[in-house]
Amino acid sequence: LQDPCSNCPAGTFCDNNRNQICSPCPPNSFSSAGGQRTCDICRQCKGVFRTRKECSSTSNAECDCTPGFHCLGAGCSMCEQDCKQGQELTKKGCKDCCFGTFNDQKRGICRPWTNCSLDGKSVLVNGTKERDVVCGPSPADLSPGASSVTPPAPAREPGHSPQ
């Protein structure tokens, strides 16, 4: 015998209290698959979360973060504060990238500048807190008399930015 509930489409539930009739999901609830015996409560985007997509009878609401924050985790389960470019978020808040490192985003950690010499290249543009170095041609490729920017000093251990 076929389960009568299997005929209930997404957006409905199989109502045991009404002889297993397919009933629409109540307000603020949804079922994303057929044959459900209950509907799930819609996610509410509250506090620092804002609604990116409204809940419907067949799909849950989706949240993102208010400006100044970005999503972390599956389905934006957490909002993390943004920093400025050239900074990283530490346990003590946003701190400038230390010398020899950079961050070109409002999130994530400061990463060491590219070491151009490892690829046999010279530094064309020095790095900053916000931007990586730009590597140029190898010193041997430069025409006689041409000079390149001095390669950066080795990066200090990350995580110790000057106060």
Partner: nanobody, 122 residues
């Protein structure tokens, strides 16, 4: 019942001061960082300030730095936001929140107050 309640809002002239309070009931505020947010009509909710639970380190948005001061009195289970040199653009509903982790991470399980209206106008 776990609850956060803001108070102290009102109408104030530009250049004036207000002190907002965020009182907790049903849990110990001293165990939590407390963040302050505000939302002006038709605008997104904006982070204003936060005070850590561990060492009472304070953090401020650039827009309020030097004018607002956050402090806490764990014995009274209350956090305060002292707002000086108020400007018309500070007009908003002010909310306090108790994130589960720290000043910089907020989840859907955090405690939030209902808000208190601050209006700066002459």
């Amino acid at each position: 019942q776990v609850q956060l309640q803001e108070s102290g809002g009102g109408l104030v002239q530009p250049g004036g001061s207000l002190r907002l309070s965020c009182a907790a009931s049903g849990f110990s505020l001293g165990l939590y960082a407390i963040g302050w947010f505000r939302q002006a009509p038709g605008k997104e909710r904006e982070w204003v300030s936060c005070i850590m639970s561990s060492d009472s380190s304070a953090y401020y948005a650039d827009s309020v730095k030097g004018r607002f001061t956050v402090s806490r009195d764990n014995a009274k289970n209350t956090v305060y936001l002292q707002m000086n040199r108020l400007k018309p653009e500070d007009t908003a509903v002010y909310y306090c929140a108790a994130p589960q982790s720290d000043c910089f991470h907020y989840s859907e399980n955090d405690y939030w107050g209902q808000g208190t209206q601050v209006t700066v106008s002459s």
